[in-house]
Interface confidence: low
């Protein structure tokens, strides 16, 4: 029986990233029953990746690990679209990290998952960046500029975002 | 504030070479990160180079990157910019300036400037 099998598909996936998540969110996505796409609970989706805000403050370094733990990476930001929906979910007072840094100093920015650094699609605040000894993004509140990017030292412990694809089931 | 005084400049045909100079003194020289700027008749002043406070990290305009190299010797309180290739482009006023901790491009973030060298590319 063909629906009985698909079931049983999708509950062996299920256990299989419950080490992961204990608890998954699934949307059927289109008219297709086959097709439906999860993130993990609480986590909110845009197009076909995954967000979460981790409030807890931690070093750069620690904050890409607390996201690979989770099966996740900090947030590469590909588009205005992409961040004008994570800011949503952002504080005004805090400062989160993003998937981006300089390890060498040299202005050559990075992508945590090899993203090519493309410079026409960056949201630095004006100014920014600036210091060749702060290595790593956030990306902050300014009120006379809104949402933008900013460059910091990446012992400095902030909040951060990670990003993951959707799981399809 | 670091004291700084800048010496080295001149005229030199294009193709030609000079080193500038850069004396600091008045404070502890290794607490500053260090940089070069110049400002040309009619034109802001702009970034040229930077070094950071050990001297492992310089970093260049892309203008002069692979002509110029910025160095420091800690224990003279002296840092350098050695100019190759010059163009007539890169006539201006030369300026040596102090940082306390950052390496950075911007120039609002220097609090110390010394008066400045002529450097002067004829072709």
């Known amino acids: 029986n063909f629906m009985y099998s698909k079931t049983v598909k999708r509950l062996s996936k299920l256990r299989e990233y419950q080490q992961y998540h204990p608890s998954l969110t699934c949307v059927m996505e289109g008219k297709d029953i086959e097709d439906w796409s999860c993130c993990p609970t609480p986590w909110t989706s845009f197009q076909s990746s995954c967000y979460f805000i981790s409030t807890g403050m931690q070093s750069w370094t620690k904050s890409q690990k607390n996201c690979s733990v989770m099966g996740a990476d900090l947030v590469v930001i590909n588009t205005r679209e992409e961040q004008d929906f994570i800011i949503q979910n952002l504080k005004r007072n805090s400062s989160y990290f993003l998937g981006l840094s300089d390890p060498g100093g040299r202005r050559h920015w990075q992508w945590v998952d090899q993203t090519p650094y493309n410079e026409n699609v960056t949201f630095w605040h004006s100014g920014e960046p600036n210091n060749l000894d702060e290595r790593c993004a956030i990306i902050n509140f300014r009120s006379s500029e809104e949402w933008g990017w900013n460059d910091i030292h990446c012992h400095v412990p902030q909040k951060s975002i990670c990003k993951m694809k959707k799981i399809y089931i | 504030q670091v004291q700084l005084q800048e010496s080295g400049g001149g005229l030199v045909q294009a193709g030609g070479s000079l080193r500038l100079s850069c004396a600091a003194s008045?404070?502890?020289?290794?607490?500053?990160?260090m940089g070069w700027f110049r400002q040309a008749p009619g034109k802001e002043r702009e970034f040229v180079a930077t070094?950071?406070?050990?001297?492992?990290?310089?970093y260049y305009a892309d203008s002069v990157k692979g002509r110029f190299t910025i160095s420091r010797d800690n224990a003279k309180n002296m840092v350098y910019l050695q100019m190759n290739s010059l163009k007539p482009e890169d006539t201006a006023v030369y300026y040596c300036?102090?940082?306390?901790?950052?390496?950075?491009?911007?120039?609002?973030?220097?609090?110390?400037w010394g008066q400045g060298t002529q450097v002067t590319v004829s072709s």
């Open positions: 300036a102090a940082n306390v901790l950052v390496t950075t491009t911007r120039l609002d973030q220097y609090d110390s």
């Open positions: 008045g404070r502890t020289f290794t607490n500053y990160a």
């Open positions: 070094i950071s406070r050990s001297g492992s990290m310089p």
